[in-house]
C-alpha cells in the first residue's frame, strides 16, 4: 500500500522570500528504493486554473522547472518527498500537488500554500496645518500581504493603566498596493494635547495574518507640547 500525507489542515503559510519546504511524506509497506520511484510536484496558481510542473525526480535524474526547486534524495530514502523552494514569492502561492509513483502504485496529495509578508510599522508626528494644541500622529504600516489588516489606537493613563481603545478622531486611509504586490496603509490619530493628561501612553496596534502577536508602537504625551522643526516632521517618533 502506498500513501502520501501532506501538511495537516491542508494549508501551509510561509513568509515572503523564505526558503519554504512544502511537506510531503510517503508511507509504503516496504523500504523505499529511490532508483525505482518517481516524484513529481505540480503547482496551480490562485488566478489561473492551469497546473504547471515544478519539479520531477526519476531514479537517476532530477529536473527543476522552477529555479532552485529541489527534493532531497537523502530525505527521500526515508520517505520524505518534501519540496524546497528558495526565495518564495507572493505569486507562487496556490495549490501544490505531490505525486509519487512506486510502479505499479501511484499516490498523491495536495496542499494550499499561502505566502504572507509582515508589516513594518512606524509612528510619525505631523503638525503641518494643525491648530494650537492639536497634534496629528500617523501610524504607517508598510510591505504587508495579504491586504486585510487591522489598525487600532489605544491609550493608558496613570488613572487607567489598562489599555483603552480610542475610537474618536481616528482616520485610517485606504490600502495602497506597491509594485511588488505588498500593501501600505496609514492610520491617523488627532489629539488635543491640552485636554490630555501628561504621561498618557498612546499605542498604535497593528494586527495582521502574518503576525503571531500584534505590532505595537507607542509614544508618551509630555507636559511640554511637541514642537518639531520642519525636518523632523516626518521623522520616526518611535
Amino acid at each position: 500500500d502506498l500513501k502520501v500525507e501532506m501538511m495537516a489542515g491542508g494549508t501551509q503559510i510561509t513568509p515572503l522570500n523564505d526558503n519554504v519546504t512544502i511537506f510531503c511524506n510517503i508511507f509504503y509497506s516496504q523500504p523505499l528504493n529511490i532508483t525505482s520511484m518517481g516524484i513529481t510536484w505540480f503547482w496551480k496558481s490562485l488566478t489561473f486554473d492551469k497546473e504547471v510542473k515544478v519539479f520531477e525526480f526519476f531514479g537517476d535524474h532530477q529536473e527543476a522547472f522552477r529555479p532552485g526547486a529541489i527534493v532531497s534524495p537523502w530525505r527521500l530514502k526515508s520517505g520524505d518527498a518534501s519540496l524546497r523552494l528558495p526565495g518564495i514569492q507572493l505569486e507562487e502561492a496556490g495549490e501544490y500537488r505531490c505525486e509519487v509513483v512506486v510502479t505499479p502504485l501511484k499516490a498523491q496529495g495536495t496542499v494550499q500554500l499561502e505566502v504572507v509578508a509582515s508589516p513594518a510599522s512606524r509612528l510619525l508626528l505631523d503638525q503641518v496645518g494643525m491648530k494650537e494644541n492639536e497634534d496629528k500622529y500617523m501610524c504607517e504600516s508598510s510591505g504587508f500581504y495579504p491586504e486585510a489588516i487591522n489598525i487600532t489606537w489605544e491609550k493608558q493613563t496613570q488613572k487607567f493603566p489598562h489599555p483603552i481603545e480610542i475610537s474618536e478622531d481616528v482616520i485610517t486611509g485606504p490600502t495602497i498596493k506597491n509594485m511588488d504586490g505588498t500593501f501600505n496603509v496609514t492610520s491617523c490619530l488627532k489629539l488635543n494635547s491640552s485636554q490630555e493628561d501628561p504621561g498618557t501612553v498612546y499605542q498604535c496596534v497593528v494586527r495582521h495574518a502574518s503576525l503571531h502577536t500584534p505590532l505595537r508602537s507607542n509614544f508618551t504625551l509630555t507636559a511640554a507640547r511637541h514642537s518639531l522643526s520642519e525636518t523632523e516632521k516626518t521623522d520616526n517618533f518611535s
Epitope: N19, T21, F23, N25, D60, H61, Q62, I70, S72, P73, W74, R75, K77, S78, G79, D80, S82, R84
Partner: antibody, heavy 120, light 111 residues
Framework: EVQLVQSGAEVKKPGASVKVSCKAS????????MDWVRQAPGKGLEWIGD????????LYNQKFRGRVTLTVDKSISTAYMELSRLRSDDTAVYYC?????????????WGQGTTVTVSS | DIVLTQTPLSLSVTPGQPASISCKAS??????????MNWYLQKPGQPPQLLIY???TLHSGIPDRFSGSGSGTDFTLKISRVEAEDVGVYYC?????????FGQGTKLEIK
Amino acid sequence: EVQLVQSGAEVKKPGASVKVSCKASGYTFTDYNMDWVRQAPGKGLEWIGDINPNNGGTLYNQKFRGRVTLTVDKSISTAYMELSRLRSDDTAVYYCARSEVFYGNYADYWGQGTTVTVSS
Amino acid sequence: DIVLTQTPLSLSVTPGQPASISCKASQSVDYDGDSYMNWYLQKPGQPPQLLIYAASTLHSGIPDRFSGSGSGTDFTLKISRVEAEDVGVYYCQQSKEDPRTFGQGTKLEIK
C-alpha cells in the same frame, strides 16, 4: 551562530544501553538532518546513521541496525542516539553533526563529542 | 559498501610547501552530474570540520589554499601552502550511498 551541544561522558557496563543527546541552536532544526558518527580510540570515523527531524525518518548503517535508535524532539530542537546491548568495542567518542540534505549531503557543523566507555 | 582508500596515510610537510592527498572510491560516487565526495580535517582533540563538499566546493570560512578536485572514483585534496595550523587527520567521505563511508585518514604533520 549554529551550535550543537552534546550530553556529558558516560561509563557503562557491557549489555547496558546509553542515550546521548544533541541540543541544536542557531538554525531551523527541521531544515537539516542530524548525522551520528563515532570514533573509537585512535581510529577513524564511522557513520552510524541519520535522522530527518521533519518526519522522524531514519537511515541506519546496517552494522548497527537493531542496536541503535535515533529520535528527535522538535519542540526542544534536540536529537538523541540510543545504543543498546553495549560491548567493549562500542567504546568511542560519539558525534552528532548537522547534515545538509537539499544541495548536496555533507556535515557542516559538529557537536563537541560524547565519550562513551564500556567496561566491566 | 563503497570503500574509500586514501594515500598517503601520513605526510610531513615544510611550512609554505604544497601537499596533496588522494582518495579512491571502489565505485563511482557521481549522481546526476554531481560528485558526492567531501573532505574533513580533524585537528587534535577536536571534532572534524568540513573543508570541501561536492568534490570541489570550499566550505564557508575555509582558507582558499585548500582545494578539491576529481570525479567518478578519483579525488584529490590539495593545500597550496601548508601552514602550522593545518596539522591533523584529513578524511574523505562519500555521501552517494548508504552507509556513508570515510577513508581511513591521512595524518599531516609539520617538518
